[in-house]
Interface confidence: low
């Protein structure tokens, strides 16, 4: 599923991401835009053999199990395939664990490079939330 901007903002808010660990909803929508272009089925291979999955590009080395990544920790205790669902519950729940891990949203390279320090509220402007 490819979400619309406001559609995703509403879904993320429904799942409790707004101001989760101090990160406003705009940060999450911005991260999803530059990680996956709002596509729940996005996958990208990394040079270390791991793969990033889903709308927030969650990594199989640490957070989920895809049965294919040597030394996977599976800290979210989920199959990576769950992160590709049009239902973003699994991605959101895992993201909450990631953002609580110490580095906050710096765990997402795209957020660090494209969203951090910008007017992230623009990503939810005009949305009925």
């Amino acid at each position: 599923k490819v979400f619309g901007r406001c559609e995703l903002a509403a879904a993320m808010k429904r799942h409790g991401l707004d101001n989760y660990r101090g990160y406003s909803l705009g940060n999450w929508v911005c991260a999803a835009k530059f990680e996956s272009n709002f596509n729940t089925q996005a996958t990208n291979r990394n040079t270390d053999g791991s793969t990033d999955y889903g709308i927030l590009q969650i990594n199989s080395r640490w957070w989920c199990n895809d049965g294919r990544t040597p030394g996977s920790r599976n800290l979210c205790n989920i199959p990576c395939s769950a992160l590709l669902s049009s239902d973003i519950t699994a991605s959101v729940n895992c993201a909450k664990k990631i953002v609580s891990d110490g580095n906050g949203m710096n765990a997402w390279v795209a957020w660090r490079n494209r969203c951090k320090g910008t007017d992230v509220q623009a990503w939810i402007r005009g949305c009925r939330l």
Partner: antibody, heavy 115, light 107 residues
């Protein structure tokens, strides 16, 4: 139960292209990788590459880049592999398999003869 | 690419014998090694995943061991239905690679 059904045997002329299909049933097609494997007598099994049908993401063995192209149709739960510029070296049995790191489910194989 | 070398290439045994098939990797692959059986004109069948995890429906006489670079598939008291080709496969890195196979035949 999980099943992968491949298309029938093909006899092709050198230089031609062929498209092999693999229809999946019994599981969520979009969220598992489909792997393609080549088997020639005396050459064992060779991994060609894989496609994740839900996203269209593909990864190819360098050896088969330019030779094999993967596509998938999620409306019919079918994965495809097209082989181009066929030569006698492409004569083989081609298998699709569901990828979990290991391959627990295989198609019955498609025999391709190039002559 | 990781190369998997299987030995012996052919193993001639009598039903009731116990045998060990070897698979050696060109570099460490942890436990990311899987074993398949293939009969003539059939698709491969997964026997063991991740070195030692038996698949459901596979007879208990099949077992796997090893780690790093050296792996073994053991068949305790071979039965006539066990004859065929055996392949190992690694999932430690891409491209996925298979061993050249061991042919288990009747003596």
């Amino acid at each position: 139960q999980v099943q992968l059904q491949e298309s029938g045997a093909e006899v092709m002329k050198p230089g031609a292209s062929v498209k092999i299909s693999c229809k999946a049933t019994g599981y969520t097609f979009t969220t598992y990788w489909i792997e393609w494997v080549k088997q020639r007598p005396g050459h064992g099994l060779e991994w060609i590459g894989e496609i994740l049908p839900g996203s269209g993401s593909t990864y190819y063995n360098e050896k088969f880049k330019g030779k094999a192209t993967f596509t998938a149709d999620t409306s019919s739960n079918t994965a495809y592999m097209q082989l181009s510029s066929l030569t006698s070296e492409d004569s083989a049995v081609y298998y699709c398999a569901r990828g979990d790191g290991w391959y627990g489910y295989w198609g019955q194989g498609t025999t391709l003869t190039v002559s | 690419d990781i190369e998997l070398t299987q030995s012996p290439a052919t193993l001639s045994v009598t039903p009731g014998d116990s045998v060990s098939l070897s698979c050696r990797a060109s570099q460490s692959i942890s436990n990311n090694l899987h074993w398949y059986q293939q009969k003539p004109h059939e698709s491969p069948r997964l026997l063991i995943k991740y070195t030692s995890q038996s698949m459901s429906g596979i007879p208990s006489r099949f077992s796997g061991s090893g780690s790093g670079t050296d792996f073994t598939l053991s068949i305790n008291s071979v039965e006539t239905e066990d004859f065929g080709m055996y392949f190992c496969q690694q999932s430690n890195s891409w491209p996925r690679t298979f061993g050249g196979g061991t042919k288990l035949e009747i003596k």
